[in-house]
């Protein structure tokens, strides 16, 4: 059983406030910022995590070339609007009534507009490409060992079903992890690839979202895998809609 039942903490999300006020005196944890109850047996949604963060004090061994429609999160942090299930609302606006549409991982997928901007649906990000560069090592990692270790990491630490880790590519020093998850593939209870990628990103940056102070320890046959650069590309089920002005800038 989890520490949440003993200490009343949330093993999977340190950005929570927990108290034994659930049914039968059970531990219940609420996300900072939104106050929404979270399930501490799985990952918290990226939307709620971003909201909590903003509320806190201030192979053929070939590498994948991201598609022309791939999005990179250049906008950085913002205080998002989340729906009752903790997902991003399709339309996000800031305090100055500037609005834009986002995908299921909260990344902007349209030009910015005003309050009249319509975002008809939350478009799903079905393919995530995590591009890593590792620090120099004595030799290259064995590709099959690296593949197995990263798949195990996503299964055990992030609780992501193995079928959603589509591929692990390696050309020293670049590692690429491909996550794929269509709407039709995602069953109730499955961790979302966007949430798993966000937890991984924060772990790699030394900003673990899990309870505790230890952080990520990733080794391949005993050799520490230390990442010095991370880029994440997001591909949506429907291509993004940006004006030509942005594309040629």
């Amino acid at each position: 059983h989890t520490a949440a039942q003993d200490n009343c903490t949330c093993p999977t999300n340190k950005m929570t406030v927990c108290s034994p006020d659930g049914p039968g005196g059970r531990c219940q944890c609420r996300a900072l910022g939104s106050g929404m109850a979270v399930d501490c047996s799985t990952l918290t949604s990226k939307c709620l995590l971003l909201k909590a963060r903003m509320s806190a004090p201030k192979n053929a061994r070939t590498l994948v070339r991201p598609s022309e429609h791939a999005l990179v999160d250049n906008d950085g942090l913002y205080d998002p609007d989340c729906d009752p299930e903790g997902r991003f609302k399709a339309r996000q606006c800031n305090q100055t009534s500037v609005c834009w549409c986002v995908n299921s991982v909260g990344v902007r997928r349209t030009d910015k507009g005003d309050l009249s901007l319509r975002c008809d649906e939350l478009v799903r990000t079905h393919h995530i490409l995590i591009d890593l560069r590792h620090r120099p090592t004595a030799g290259a990692f064995n590709h099959s060992d690296l593949d197995a270790e990263l798949r195990r990491l996503f299964r055990e630490r992030y609780r992501l079903h193995p079928k959603f880790v589509a591929a692990v590519h390696y050309e020293q020093p670049t590692i690429q992890i491909e996550l794929r998850q269509n709407t039709s593939q995602k069953a109730a209870g499955d961790v979302d690839i966007g949430d798993a990628a966000y937890y991984f990103e924060r772990d790699i940056k030394g900003e673990s979202l899990f309870q505790g102070r230890g952080g990520l320890d990733l080794r391949v046959r005993g050799e520490p895998l230390q990442v010095e650069r991370t880029l994440i590309y997001y591909l949506d089920e429907i291509p993004p809609k940006f004006s030509m002005k942005r594309l040629t800038a």
Epitope: A3, T9, E156, Q211, G212, G214, L216, D217, G222
Partner: nanobody, 128 residues
Amino acid sequence: QVQLQESGGGSVQAGGSLRLSCAASGFTFSRACMGWFRQASGKEREGVAQVYTGGGSTSYADSVKGRFTISQDNAKNTLYLQMNSLKPEDTAVYYCAVGQPYGACYYSDLAPADFSYWGQGTQVTVSS
């Protein structure tokens, strides 16, 4: 589903020895920070020892240094605590705990909040 099951507790005279075992399942045993904690009646849970099962680095509470030894058997997915020169003040319920898979140990101190999953505990009673 992470599961931990302690065994090996019991009653012993002061100066005696016991060996606690913790059978683990539901995660890759050699990729985690694992520890032993204890809770005496009416007192808070306190750290006893911890080890990163992938690297073997260990740390101990001052009160047990030189008397207790934490070890592991990766083939059996089992964590051990060898307790020698037991004292009456070692009387407590002993718990096995593990952090998130692939989580490093935090070595400055042994805090329950750094561990995510817990066993049910095994009673150790030391009489003088």
